[in-house]
Interface confidence: low
């Protein structure tokens, strides 16, 4: 069998909301993957599991099942959304993300994704990790790849 290539393209959009009382930020982050099947037979994309980390803490997880199949020598672009929550010991970020007199609201997030594919009863997992910049101060739609090159607030360690 030939390889199945998974390429993490980047953040497609990030939609933000806030809970004032809890000083909590909710970010729905939609990511884009390209999955290429280099084989002469179809493969099934069985599931995608993803998680997002901020300051070495997991702030969101998602799992998509029975997603699609990819034909021979074909490629499919797949979007998946991870709901994330920045709260509790990271509530100091609430000020940063919501204050108008702060000009730059980008934060750095670690995106981790694992794609499980199957063909002829055989299962294969491919994982990717990428640091991405996301604006936590407003709803943002990114051109693909754009979120890799923004100014960023480094999280407090």
């Amino acid at each position: 069998p030939r390889s199945i290539d998974v390429k993490y393209i980047g953040v497609k959009s990030a939609y933000v909301s806030y809970d004032v009382q809890k000083r909590t930020i909710y970010l729905n982050i939609t990511n884009t993957l390209n999955i290429t099947n280099n084989n002469y037979y179809s493969v099934e994309v069985e599931n995608i599991t993803a998680q997002v980390q901020f300051a070495k803490t997991v702030i969101g997880k998602a799992r998509l099942n029975n997603i699609t199949h990819i034909g021979p020598l074909d490629m499919k672009q797949i979007d998946y959304t991870v709901p994330t929550v920045i709260a509790e010991e990271m509530s100091y970020m609430y000020d940063f993300c919501t204050l108008i007199s702060i000009k730059v609201h980008n934060i750095v997030l670690m995106m981790q994704v694992t794609v499980t594919t199957t063909y002829f009863g055989h299962s294969e997992q491919i994982s990717q990790e990428r640091y991405q910049y996301v604006d936590c101060g407003r709803n943002t739609t990114y051109q693909l790849g754009q979120s890799e090159y923004l100014n960023v607030l480094q999280p407090q360690q």
């Epitope: 004032v20 009382q21 919501t98 108008i100 007199s101 000009k103």
Partner: antibody
Framework: QVQLQQPGAELVKPGASVKLSCKAS????????MHWVRQRPGQGLEWIGN????????HYNHKFKDKATLIVDKSSSTAYLQLSSLTSEDSAVFYC????????????????WGQGTSVTVSS | DIVMTQATPSIPVTPGESVSISCRSS???????????LFWFLQRPGQSPQLLIY???NLASGVPDRFSGSGSGTAFTLRISRVEAEDVGVYYC?????????FGSGTKLEIK
């Protein structure tokens, strides 16, 4: 220690322009917004605008949009307020003041002020 | 623009007394993040303004704890307990929530 040095006075003729300086020392110039405030004789304080020295991003009070231009020179850690088409109405003391800015403006506004430059517009 | 109103132009006070200076805003200064973006400054005669209080109730560095700030989203009070002679000057409130930032007209504290 943090210091904002401003010249004491400027005498300008009506219709002319003036460029007021505010030299910063004792802190990283590019990490803090610089604000400018006007105080006419016997009057209160009016916010003119602010500038982020790291990239010259500015916000103006619309009242001063055609009168004031904010500039910075990073190499000398100096902020400038340029005032144009001066009239007697523009006679005032002009203060510069810094506040934390960029990523970290959590609201500690204008914690250090210059001594102010008194501008007199007279022929 | 947000209008800041200081309705009392001057307050005469005897040293050792307490005094409250009020300020109102035309719009709530309570931000979605829970902070209230109101500041108090003192301008002593012939001097530059000095920051006293930030975010409505936080004492600025080096300011005596005789000063305190309180309020709601639109009504604010600066309280000075045990007024001293050095407290004379004009007290200004300022909103820092929205551009353009705006000051109140000031309240002059005078010693009787």
């Amino acid at each position: 220690q943090v210091q904002l040095q401003q010249p004491g006075a400027e005498l300008v003729k009506p219709g002319a322009s003036v460029k007021l300086s505010c030299k910063a020392s004792g802190y990283t110039f590019t990490n803090h917004w610089m604000h400018w405030v006007r105080q006419r004789p016997g009057q209160g304080l009016e916010w003119i605008g602010n500038i982020d020295p790291s990239d010259s991003d500015t916000h103006y009070n619309h009242k001063f949009k055609d009168k004031a231009t904010l500039i910075v020179d990073k190499s000398s850690s100096t902020a400038y307020l340029q005032l144009s088409s001066l009239t007697s109405e523009d006679s005032a003391v002009f203060y510069c003041a810094r506040s934390r800015g960029g990523y970290y403006d959590y609201g500690e506004a204008m914690d250090y002020w210059g001594q102010g430059t008194s501008v007199t517009v007279s022929s | 623009d947000i209008v800041m109103t200081q309705a009392t132009p001057s307050i005469p006070v005897t040293p050792g007394e307490s005094v409250s200076i009020s300020c109102r805003s035309s719009k709530s200064l309570l931000h979605v993040n829970g902070n209230t973006y109101l500041f108090w400054f003192l301008q002593r005669p012939g001097q530059s303004p000095q920051l006293l209080i930030y975010r409505m109730s936080n004492l600025a560095s080096g300011v005596p704890d005789r000063f305190s700030g309180s309020g709601s989203g639109t009504a604010f009070t600066l309280r000075i307990s045990r007024v001293e002679a050095e407290d004379v000057g004009v007290y200004y409130c300022m909103q820092h929530l929205e551009y353009p930032f705006t000051f109140g007209s000031g309240t002059k504290l005078e010693i009787k």
